[in-house]
């Protein structure tokens, strides 16, 4: 990758952790009333998330992830939930790279859609400090 | 077998610069990550860098603009290119292989780097 | 940037017993916790991976426990041979850090 490809990896990167923390903050906002029920549903977490290779496994989780939105008020995000899940596997699918022979492994416990997003916002935020 | 040779170690001065090397043998080098760590005289375990099997690079801020982690899987070799050198990185230089969902699996013999006057 | 801490750089023990390392994380990193033996003058080698599967030829004598924040590796029925430096490194994240260290020695 060049100087400027990887400019670009940072701001896709930085494009990807506002979406997800956008997300994170609308069904933490205090007056969903679908949190209860959004909490019951259980996504995979990867084995590993470090590497931009490692985005296959969130790339698999984007459609349960808009099940899950779709519960929510819509009020609560400024975009409707297939928007923005489709902006973000537009990100994905850029940032992963053609790799299609990738398979994910995941972690053997699932976790919430709250612990699944700061999983993903957790990554975001380390390679954005650590790609050069 | 999985084998990894680190060469290029040597005493160089404050401010100068070396280029670490790094032979792989036994696997499937361009699908990998490789990273290098290091280790200060009696001290412990440091992660340098880490390139990808896409080239991207990554690192900690304590060696960013100084060091350069790069990839020739045409010849199965790691390289690290270390400028601006300080006393503070005096240390064994370990390449080793960044298993694609595990822990670092393998490690090298390392090579000494002494950066001192 | 996630710490990793071994508060026991030195534990004594002898051939045959049995010996317990701890390491302890800054932050939650799940199960994504390595463990490796120095020897001394000799490179790492890594023996846990995913807090408690031994890589292929480690001895059932090494055990990896833990997930979240506390981890330890257990040597039982501890040989000579074992003398050596162990550290617990995370890979939850970027950058990779490693705990100080922990020298086993042999009574």
């Known amino acids: 990758p060049t100087s400027s490809s990887t400019k670009k990896t940072q701001l896709q990167l930085e494009h990807l952790l506002l979406d997800l923390q956008m997300i994170l903050n609308g069904i933490n906002n205090y007056k969903n009333p679908k949190l209860t029920r959004m909490l019951t549903f259980k996504f995979y977490m990867p084995k590993k998330a470090t590497e931009l290779k490692h985005l296959q496994c969130l790339e698999e989780e984007l459609k349960p992830l808009e099940e899950v939105l779709n519960l929510a008020q819509s009020k609560n995000f400024h975009l409707r939930p297939r928007d923005l899940i489709s902006n973000i596997n537009v990100i994905v699918l850029e940032l992963k790279g053609s790799e299609t022979t990738f398979m994910c492994e995941y972690a053997d416990e699932t976790a919430t859609i709250v612990e699944f997003l700061n999983r993903w916002i957790t990554f975001s935020q380390s390679i954005i400090s650590t790609l050069t | 077998e999985v084998q990894l040779v680190e060469s290029g170690g040597g005493l160089v001065q404050p401010g100068g610069s070396l280029r670490l090397s790094c032979a792989a043998s036994g696997f499937t080098f361009s699908s990998y990550t490789l990273a290098w760590v290091r280790q200060a005289p009696g001290k412990g375990l440091e992660w340098v860098a880490a390139?990808?099997?896409?080239?991207?690079?990554y690192s900690p801020d304590t060696v960013r603009g100084r060091f350069t982690i790069s990839r020739d899987n045409a010849k199965n070799s790691l390289y690290l290119q270390m400028n601006s050198l300080r006393a503070e990185d005096t240390a064994v230089y370990y390449c080793a292989r960044d298993s694609n969902w595990d822990a670092l699996d393998y490690w090298g013999q390392g090579t000494t780097v002494t950066v001192s006057s | 940037d996630i710490v990793m801490t071994q508060s026991q750089k030195f534990m004594s023990t002898s051939v045959g017993d049995r010996v317990s390392v701890t390491c302890k994380a800054s932050q939650n990193v799940g199960t994504n916790v390595g463990w490796y033996q120095q020897k001394p003058g000799q490179s790492p080698k890594a023996l846990i991976y995913s807090a408690s599967f031994r890589y292929s030829g480690v001895p059932d004598r090494f055990t990896g426990s833990g997930s979240g924040t506390d981890f330890s590796l257990t040597i039982s029925n501890v040989k000579s041979e074992d003398l050596a430096e162990y550290f617990c490194q995370q890979y939850y994240t970027y950058p990779y850090t490693f705990g100080g260290g922990t020298k086993l020695e042999i009574k």
């Open positions: 390139i990808d099997s896409s080239s991207y690079t």
